[in-house]
């Protein structure tokens, strides 16, 4: 007769791992006991448990709960075991012995290999700015029996850099995401993608890039000046930013306060009907948290009889 | 320390029953298994079985099925062994014993034994 | 059941000098990691005491002159350089199988 086993049986953190010890023998030979031990303590070999054709099952103190017989219907000849809900601590080296009738004693080794899935962390970068060089986006972190593969997945442009810590019984990997931070990758996702062989499918952990910037600011709305004449309704000025955060818009006028009738709604400066007393430096200043930005436009007033005046002017001058 | 204590000698009639007793100490009883082993007088050593404390699984050696009955009492951390039906045969210093930390074989912890006198 | 057999029964040896105890097993005893094979020594009125584990593995606190060889099913115990205190039966154990079974003892004397 021979034993049949595994030579490793890999099981996921909290699992069952079932211990496969069957004695194939010729007829009418006979089990009388199988004694299981984990084989790779320093001091000696520690019982796991006595399987005795007699006596039944016995499981020593140190296992009391953990260590059961597969399920009915049981073979006589099959002195397989089961180790509930496995930790990292099981994870080592198991003998069976076997003691037959008549042709005596066999013994089979097996590893017992316990995967212990990560549980990923994404841990964003300082705040991201235009303008800085190569920055950390963001780092994320896996610690998993075996070491879990951590890589990052995302249209953005940068560089990676991964370093691994071995513990006892485990291994955390750490990669860093580098960019040089643009406005265009604002909104952009980056995600960790951490795989591990006791994971049923990939973890993926994204993360949105915020890039802090404050675009040039520029004013729309004096495209044509002869548009700028007395008596004009509806007349507006609009400030033109963009950024992240978004920004907040200021209106004020250089050379004296903002006249009265005109109104101020966020980006936009609103005039009632013109008047000379409306021409002016008028400055927006927008801002965010990152950084502020100025422009300044000179509205001029026409007034249409003055024009047609000088036109007669022009005229008779000639 | 570990310690296994013992009871004292017997001297007991043929046919009659006695319990001995293995007091433990220094470590945590439910922890390890407890075995008891005879010697007879000027002779080897002969294993007579073992017991789980945590939950009072017994093996006995065939040759004392009937003969020996094991026990625990976990309150007391203290092991018993009962030998019934004694004849001479029967006398002979029993030993109460506990493998070492981290091993489960090899007996590192001794009663210091108990006499057990047969005879009329 | 596994019958394990000690030679000699009884030992004479000078202070000084090596002692060989023999203990063979009627079937192995020995797996690729450990050979489940203990060495005791007892003195008269005293439990036995755990001087070898694991054949070769050597019990805390035991004497450096005691050592332990062998597998599968011929085991050795030396002593040496044998002293007046290691005068005392000496014994061979199994835990392979159950039931664990010993050795019929060897006398050592150190003359």
């Known amino acids: 007769g021979e034993l049949e086993t595994s030579d490793v049986v890999t099981v996921v953190l909290g699992q069952d791992a079932k211990l496969p010890c069957f004695y194939r023998g010729d007829s009418g030979e006979q089990v009388g006991q199988v004694a299981w031990a984990r084989v790779d303590a320093g001091e000696g070999a520690q019982e796991l448990a006595l399987l005795h054709s007699k006596y039944g099952l016995h499981v020593s103190p140190a296992y009391e709960g953990r260590v059961e017989q597969p399920p009915p219907p049981r073979n006589p000849l099959d002195g397989s075991v089961l180790l509930r809900n496995a930790v990292q601590a099981d994870e080592g080296e198991y003998e069976c012995r076997v003691s037959t009738f008549p042709a005596g004693s066999f013994q089979a080794r097996l590893r017992l290999r316990v995967l212990v899935p990560p549980l990923p962390s994404l841990n964003p970068g300082p705040a991201l700015e235009e303008g800085q060089g190569l920055t950390l986006a963001a780092s994320c972190t896996a610690e998993g029996s075996p070491a879990p593969s951590v890589t990052w997945d995302t249209e953005v442009k940068g560089t990676t850099s991964s370093r691994s810590f071995k513990h006892s019984r485990s291994a955390a990997v750490t990669s860093e995401f580098h960019l040089v931070p643009s406005r265009s990758m604002n909104g952009q996702p980056l995600t960790c993608v951490v795989s591990h062989p006791g994971l049923l499918q990939d973890q993926r952990i994204t993360h949105i890039l915020h890039v802090s910037f404050l675009a040039e600011a520029s004013v729309r709305g004096l495209e044509d000046q002869n548009l700028w004449h007395i008596g004009r309704e509806g007349a507006m000025l609009k400030c033109l930013s963009e950024g992240q955060p978004p920004p907040s818009y200021n209106w004020t006028r250089l050379d004296g306060p903002l006249p009265s009738g005109v109104r101020v709604d966020g980006d936009t400066l609103g005039f009632p009907p013109l008047t000379t007393e409306h021409s002016g430096i008028y400055v927006c200043h927008v801002s965010n948290e990152f950084s502020s930005r100025d422009s300044q436009v000179t509205v001029d007033v026409l007034d249409p009889q003055e024009d047609s005046g000088k036109q007669v002017d022009l005229v008779s001058a000639s | 320390e570990v310690q296994l204590q013992q009871s004292g000698p017997e001297l007991v009639k043929p046919g009659a029953s006695v319990k001995i007793s293995c007091k433990t100490s220094?470590?945590?009883?439910?922890?390890?298994?407890i075995h008891w082993v005879k010697q007879n007088h000027g002779k080897s050593l002969e294993w007579i079985g073992r017991i789980n404390p945590k939950n009072g699984d017994i093996i006995h050696n065939q040759n004392f099925m009937g003969k020996a009955t094991l026990t625990v009492d976990k309150s007391s951390s203290t092991a018993y062994m009962e030998l019934r039906s004694l004849t001479s045969e029967d006398s002979a210093v029993c030993y109460c014993a506990r493998s070492g930390y981290g091993s489960s074989y090899g007996f590192a912890y001794w009663g210091q034994g108990t006499l057990v006198t047969v005879s009329a | 059941d596994i019958v394990m057999t000690q030679s000699p029964t009884s030992l004479v040896v000078s202070l000084g000098q090596r002692a060989t105890i023999s203990c063979r097993a009627s079937q192995s005893v020995t797996t690729p990691r450990y050979s489940y094979m203990h060495w005791y020594q007892q003195k008269p009125g005293q439990p036995p005491k755990l001087l070898i584990k694991?054949?070769?593995n050597l019990e805390s606190g035991v004497p450096a002159r005691f050592s332990g060889s062998g597998s599968g099913t011929d085991f050795t115990l030396n002593i040496h350089p044998v002293e007046e205190e290691d005068t005392a039966t000496y014994y061979c154990q199994h835990s392979w199988e159950i039931p664990y079974t010993f050795g019929g003892g060897t006398k050592l004397e150190i003359k």
């Open positions: 220094g470590y945590t009883f439910t922890e390890y298994t």
């Open positions: 694991y054949a070769s």
